[in-house]
């Protein structure tokens, strides 16, 4: 038994680093493979993460984690019984991957303005909670050309636009996604699209 | 009540081994990790060994090293010190301590807030 | 190892009046922010140390509120707001960050 592909890592900086990896022939994951991970820091022990099967050959583990912070290091040491495969270490301050942004709301009786307003995926006491920009997607069910991401760059989860931007008397869908420049992160997944229907008073035209 | 109470102290002769105990309770012992902390007579506190919950990792001061060893059976809640070729400057009042929370991933630090009567021990011959 | 230097080593003070002492580390104890492994402990005459602050800044269970702890990095300070009879003995600062653990020299409060 061998590991054809490394684990690699990310963490979402909160409480879960998910490691994935692929082995060289299929396995049952949750029975023969065990990952240990530790954190380097005094008196510290090392917890195990039963991995769960991903296709075939691959794997993936939960690690779960009480915090992060940006000193911390994990050593990695994947077992297959007695067998050690890999070892390894990781950074969760340096592949992190923010949790997905939730209860994504289009307001549409704000006059002719569309309100989204979403929520920021992690306690306040958290790190990124004040770090998170995010870009918005909305797009025509009827009309897959009618594509268009709105960056929002400051701190707070919301975004207005003008109804009469998009078409008036289709079905829109709306996600959002988040990352955080500090920690050069990449994208969170989409959170859970929301559908409205875009409707709005066309301006009264004066002959 | 969250109590740690010391016992093996004595007098011994240099070059011989004595043995201290610290029952804990109040509080999941297994959970926490332990600390031996000595004062000599007159002079500050000193930091000895600590051990994690489990008991797998273990650290020393380089002035104990290779002659005092750490351990713990956490089904009787008990930390023991086991002291081997015994020195004068060994001579002190022992504490055992409560130290940090270490089944968390990063162990949690509430300070040595929980600290023995002391025990203890004179070399001498 | 790291060393700690406390001052003063004496400090005489009224009752009433506030006290300060000053540790300063000879390496950074900040492991990562808000995480400063400093600690601060009262020893009164014959009896065991007792924690009065951890984590730099954080009252343990019981400690009056007199007591508070500050600083970050190498340079942390315990300040009495109102020093009583009772303060009075040994005050210690101690690392926790690396092995060993260090203490200060400690720092004797007596009543003026």
């Known amino acids: 038994m061998k590991v054809l592909q490394e684990p690699t890592c990310v963490s979402d900086y909160m409480s879960i680093s998910t490691c994935e990896w692929k082995m060289n022939g299929p396995t049952n994951c949750s029975t023969e493979l065990r990952l240990l991970y530790q954190l380097v820091f005094l008196l510290s022990e090392a917890h195990t993460c039963i991995p769960e099967n991903n296709g075939g050959a691959g794997c993936v583990c939960h690690l779960l984690m009480d915090d992060v912070v940006s000193a911390d290091n994990y050593t990695l040491d994947l077992w297959a019984g007695q067998q050690l495969l890999w070892k390894g270490s990781f950074k969760p301050s340096e592949h992190v991957k923010p949790r997905a942004p939730g209860n994504l709301t289009v307001h549409t009786n704000v006059s002719d303005t569309l309100l989204l307003t979403w929520s920021n995926p992690y306690p306040p006491d958290n790190y990124l909670y004040n770090h998170l920009t995010y870009a918005v997607n909305i797009w025509s069910e009827n009309d897959p050309a009618d594509f268009r991401i709105y960056n929002v760059t400051y701190l707070e989860p919301s975004l207005r636009i003008a109804a009469s931007t998009l078409k008036s008397g289709i079905s829109y869908r709306a996600r959002v996604r988040a990352w955080a420049q500090c920690y050069n992160t990449t994208w969170s997944e989409w959170s859970p699209s929301t559908k409205w229907h875009n409707s709005y008073r066309e301006p009264f035209e004066q002959h | 009540e969250v109590q740690l109470v010391e016992s093996g102290g004595g007098l011994e002769q240099p070059g011989g081994s004595l043995r201290l105990s610290c029952a804990g309770s109040?509080?999941?012992?297994?959970?926490?990790?332990m600390t031996w902390v000595r004062q000599a007579p007159g002079k500050g506190l000193e930091w000895v060994s600590s051990?994690?919950?489990?008991?797998?990792?273990?650290y020393y001061a380089d002035s104990v090293k290779g002659r005092f060893t750490i351990s713990r059976d956490n089904s009787k809640n008990t930390l023991y010190l086991q002291m081997n070729s015994l020195r004068a400057e060994d001579t002190a009042v022992y504490y055992c301590?409560?130290?940090?929370?270490?089944?968390?991933?990063?162990?949690?630090?509430?300070?040595?807030?929980?600290w023995g009567q002391g025990t203890t021990v004179t070399v001498s011959s | 190892d790291i060393v700690m230097t406390q001052s003063p080593l004496s400090l005489p003070v009224t009752p009433g009046e506030p006290a300060s002492i000053s540790c300063r580390s000879s390496q950074s104890l900040d492991y990562s922010y808000g995480y400063n492994y400093l600690d601060w402990y009262l020893q009164k005459s014959g009896q065991s140390p007792q924690l009065l602050i951890y984590?730099?800044?954080n009252r343990a269970s019981g400690v009056p509120d007199r007591f508070s702890g500050s600083g970050s990095g190498t340079d942390f300070t315990l300040k009495i707001s109102r020093v009583e009879a009772e303060d009075v003995g040994f005050y210690y600062c101690?690392?926790?960050?690396?092995?060993?653990?260090?203490f200060g020299q400690g720092t004797k409060l007596e009543i003026k």
């Open positions: 051990i994690s919950g489990s008991g797998t990792n273990t």
């Open positions: 984590l730099a800044s």
């Open positions: 101690m690392q926790s960050l690396h092995t060993p653990y260090t």
């Open positions: 301590a409560k130290d940090r929370l270490s089944v968390s991933t990063r162990p949690k630090y509430y300070g040595l807030d929980v």
């Open positions: 109040g509080f999941t012992f297994r959970d926490y990790a």
